[in-house]
Each structure stands twice: as structure tokens, then as C-alpha cells.
């Protein structure tokens, strides 16, 4: 296991636990609250975080508007039930069984229902748009080295493939990020973009996943970059099925 | 050598407790999991919760939430289990166990026989 | 819940005979990080807590004797003794240890003709 030896630790996921009783005493390491071994040399998938924490082409004027099948996750924090992979489970229920099927990560992408809910398949997220306001500075940043300092952070701190950074988007005071990775373009062993989207997210808001790592400091051309506002947009490869009633809301 | 001691047999009535210990030695105890399984006369083995004393993570058997309380006291290198509202069913024999891909330790087991 | 099925539930065979028992699961207990099977057997006899056999699916247990051995991945496991001895008279076990709830099969009873 890629786990430190000497004080077997999770570099990369800093919700387990570490032990070395793995094959041969060697140290391995169980997310908490699932029990599922984690690779510690990647990142850990959203799903098992999530259980752990409940237990581009530059044109002018290029910001993008959300598809009308953009999801936000509105929902907040919940208990999922992950696959063996821990990847999400197509389908989520609460204490309450009231059932609800999401995508690749874990949004809703159905109206709630009961247990005769039925989701065929897990919907895979393509496409997320994150869509960030920083805070005023002097002035604007300089979008090829913004440009330049998110790609790195994204291919050194979460180890995502730069082929997956789609575009990265400028217009004081917004920044927005696009991933995208079909199913036929992730490859054994790449870093899905949910999980890479979701260390992001946790590492903008102050609450890094990273084991004894300091937290995000971003900056350009060593001007702080500091985040006031995060959205996340996320496409999936089919369209979500929600009612028209909460269309409309 | 790796040993697990646990305490001895108990005959409870039903609508009460029992608490299980098992003292660990020849081994850092806050460094491995320790997990509790039960099985009642002629039956299978049944995984009824584990804890990482180091840290004092713990995790439950959803069958049993509510009704088992694992907990470890590092000064001595002793866990315990707990089961309340004890009924008829419950009559096992419990075992502690070191978890892990290579810890074949388990404890000697204890019997609790749960008659009115 | 993970859920274990082993089959058969009891079989005899004379000493010296080779015998194959199998454990099925309803999820994968191949670990995509590590490539590792989450998946020990145990053997327990009357009287005694059980004793650690295989874990990893295929890796035995240091001082247990090599006529146990261990195969499979994914969902289809099967523990086989090359040549059975009067001192393997026992309830054999699988344990899944991959995600909470661990989880065991209903065990495999070895008796001898």
C-alpha cells in the first residue's frame, strides 16, 4: 500500500483510519464510517467522503450559462450508500424510506419517492462547471497566468489528468472552471472529476480532505486568490428526470 | 504472543444487560482494530461492531444499534461490550477478535445465556 | 448488506480425498484501489473460537498447513483442501471484510466417512 509506512498515514484522505494490518502487517487504511480500504497514492471517492463525514479555448466574452440540465446540489449533506467500487449506489433512500436517484456524484437527479423507485443505472456527471466570485483585489488577475495556476492546481493537488480541465473562464470578479470526462474517455486509474470537483470544493471552503497538509493557499503571480462564492454545475450524460412542478417552482 | 482474555460466562434475565470484557496483550492495542462477534447455540457467526481503540472510532451492526455500546479503555488495554434489553435470542457465545487481513486472533469467547 | 452463500451446507468425504467448498457473494469484494479481495476463511471446530485459515481470498495464514488453499475474485470463492485429514472435521466459514457490516457465510460442515 502507498500508505506512509513509518507512521501509516493517509496522505490523500485524512477521514480514515490507518492501521498496519494489512496483508504482511503492512499499513493500510479504512475510510471511516464505510470500512473500504482507500488507495492513499489518489484522491478517495466523493461517495465514501461523504459517508466518512456523516460517521479551454479563451474567446472574448466566454463566461458560460448553465444548460437547463445543469443540477446544483441543493439537497446538502446525506448518508449515501456506496457500491463496492464506493461509487455511489444509483439509488439512495433515507431512515425514512423515502428514495431518490442521483448521479456519478451522489446529486439528485429524480423527484423523491418511495422504495418502489427504481434507478436502472448510475448517470454519469460529464460536464461540471464550478463558478467561483473572488474577492475585490487591486486589480483584474491575468487570465493566462489564472489560467496557468488552476490547471496546475488541479493536475498536482488532485491529480487530474490536464485533458479533463476543458476551459477555465475570466471576467472580474468570476472565475469559472469547466471539467469534463466522458465514461469512454476515463481511463483505469484516472481521477474521476466529481472527486477531484469535490476535494476542490472542500479545500475553497477551509475544510481540506489532505492529511496534514496546510489548507489551499491559491495564488497568481503571488497575489492571493481568495474565494467568496462557490456554485457547482453539474450535466449529466442523460438528462435528469425531475416533474414539472418543481420546473416550474 | 498476541492474547485475548475475555471475561467469564454471565446468565442474565430478559430486559437486562450484559457487559463483555476482553483484555488485549502482546500487541499495541491503539493501533488495531478490535471487533465483537456473536454466535448463538448451533448457529452462524454474526458481526456485531467493531472499535479502533486509538482513536475510539467505532462502528455498529445496524441490527444491533441501540441496544450495543463498544468502548475500550487504553490504560489497561481492555474493550467491552455491552448489550441491553436482553431477550431470549440473545443467548451466544460473544468473542472479541483483532481485525485486520492477517490477525487471526480471537478470544476465548464468553457465554451469555439469557433465561427467565 | 453484503451477503454470503456457501454451498454446500455439510459434506463427508474420506480422509486422503480432495474436497473444493464455495462461497458466493452478492457484491464484488475485489477492491479496485488495491486490487485485494476482502475475503478471509475461517475454520472453527466444536468448542473453539474460529481460526484464521486464508485472507485476501488466496493467502494462507502463516502455520496453516498448505493442503488449504484459497481461489477466486469478485464475487466466486473457493476454499479447497488437497487432502483431507481426520483433524479438518470442522465448520468452515467465509467472511467478507470489505465494507461494514462485515459479514459471514452460514458455513460449509466437513465431516468424514
Known amino acids: 500500500h502507498t500508505a506512509a509506512q513509518d507512521n501509516c498515514t493517509c496522505p490523500t484522505n485524512k477521514m480514515t483510519v490507518c492501521s498496519p494490518d494489512g496483508p504482511g502487517g503492512r499499513c493500510q487504511c479504512r475510510a471511516l464510517g464505510s470500512g473500504m480500504a482507500v488507495d492513499c497514492s489518489t484522491l478517495t471517492s466523493k461517495c465514501l467522503l461523504l459517508k466518512a463525514r456523516m460517521s479551454a479555448p479563451k474567446n472574448a466574452r466566454t463566461l458560460v450559462r448553465p444548460s437547463e440540465h445543469a443540477l446544483v446540489d441543493n439537497d446538502g449533506l446525506y448518508d449515501p450508500d456506496c457500491d463496492p467500487e464506493g461509487r455511489f449506489k444509483a439509488r439512495q433512500c433515507n431512515q425514512t424510506s423515502v428514495c431518490w436517484c442521483v448521479n456519478s456524484v451522489g446529486v439528485r437527479r429524480t423527484d423523491k419517492g418511495d422504495l418502489s423507485l427504481r434507478c436502472d443505472e448510475l448517470v454519469r456527471t460529464h460536464h461540471i462547471l464550478i463558478d467561483l466570485r473572488h474577492r475585490p483585489t487591486a486589480g483584474a488577475f491575468n487570465h493566462s497566468d489564472l489560467d496557468a495556476e488552476l490547471r496546475r492546481l488541479f493536475r498536482e493537488r488532485y491529480r487530474l489528468h490536464p485533458k479533463f480541465v476543458a476551459a477555465v473562464h475570466y471576467e472580474q470578479p468570476t472565475i469559472q472552471i469547466e471539467l469534463r470526462q466522458n465514461t469512454s474517455q476515463k481511463a483505469a486509474g484516472d481521477v474521476d472529476i466529481g472527486d477531484a470537483a469535490y476535494y476542490f470544493e472542500r479545500d475553497i471552503k477551509g475544510e481540506s480532505l489532505f492529511q496534514g497538509r496546510g489548507g489551499l493557499d491559491l495564488r497568481v503571480r503571488g497575489e492571493p486568490l481568495q474565494v467568496e462564492r462557490t456554485l457547482i454545475y453539474y450535466l449529466d450524460e442523460i438528462p435528469p428526470k425531475f416533474s414539472m412542478k418543481r420546473l416550474t417552482a | 504472543q498476541v492474547q485475548l482474555v475475555q471475561s467469564g460466562a454471565e446468565v442474565k434475565k430478559p430486559g437486562a444487560s450484559v457487559k463483555v470484557s476482553c483484555k488485549a496483550s502482546?500487541?499495541?492495542?491503539?493501533?488495531?482494530?478490535l471487533g465483537w462477534v456473536r454466535q448463538a447455540p448451533g448457529q452462524g457467526l454474526e458481526w456485531m461492531g467493531n472499535?479502533?481503540?486509538?482513536?475510539?472510532?467505532?462502528n455498529y451492526n445496524e441490527k444491533f444499534k441501540g441496544r450495543v455500546t463498544i468502548t475500550a479503555d487504553t490504560s489497561t488495554s481492555t474493550a467491552y461490550m455491552e448489550l441491553s434489553s436482553l431477550r431470549s435470542e440473545d443467548t451466544a457465545v460473544y468473542y472479541c477478535a483483532r481485525e485486520g487481513s492477517n490477525s487471526g486472533y480471537w478470544g476465548q469467547g464468553t457465554l451469555v445465556t439469557v433465561s427467565s | 448488506d453484503i451477503v454470503m452463500t456457501q454451498s454446500p451446507d455439510s459434506l463427508a468425504v474420506s480422509a486422503g480425498e480432495r474436497v473444493t467448498m464455495n462461497c458466493k457473494s452478492s457484491q464484488s469484494l475485489l477492491n479496485s484501489g488495491n486490487q485485494q479481495n476482502y475475503l478471509a476463511w475461517y475454520q472453527q471446530k466444536p468448542g473453539q473460537p474460529p481460526k484464521l485459515l486464508i485472507y485476501?481470498?488466496?493467502t494462507r495464514e502463516s502455520g496453516v498447513p498448505d493442503r488449504f488453499s484459497g481461489s477466486g475474485s469478485g464475487t466466486d470463492f473457493t476454499l479447497t483442501i488437497s487432502s483431507v485429514q481426520a483433524e479438518d472435521v470442522a465448520v468452515y466459514y467465509c467472511?467478507?471484510?470489505?465494507?461494514?457490516?462485515?459479514?459471514f457465510g452460514q458455513g460449509t460442515k466437513l465431516e468424514i466417512k
Open positions: 472499535i479502533f481503540p486509538g482513536s475510539a472510532y467505532i
Open positions: 485476501g481470498a488466496s
Open positions: 502482546g500487541y499495541t492495542f491503539t493501533i488495531y482494530w
Open positions: 467472511q467478507s471484510d470489505h465494507i461494514y457490516p462485515y459479514t
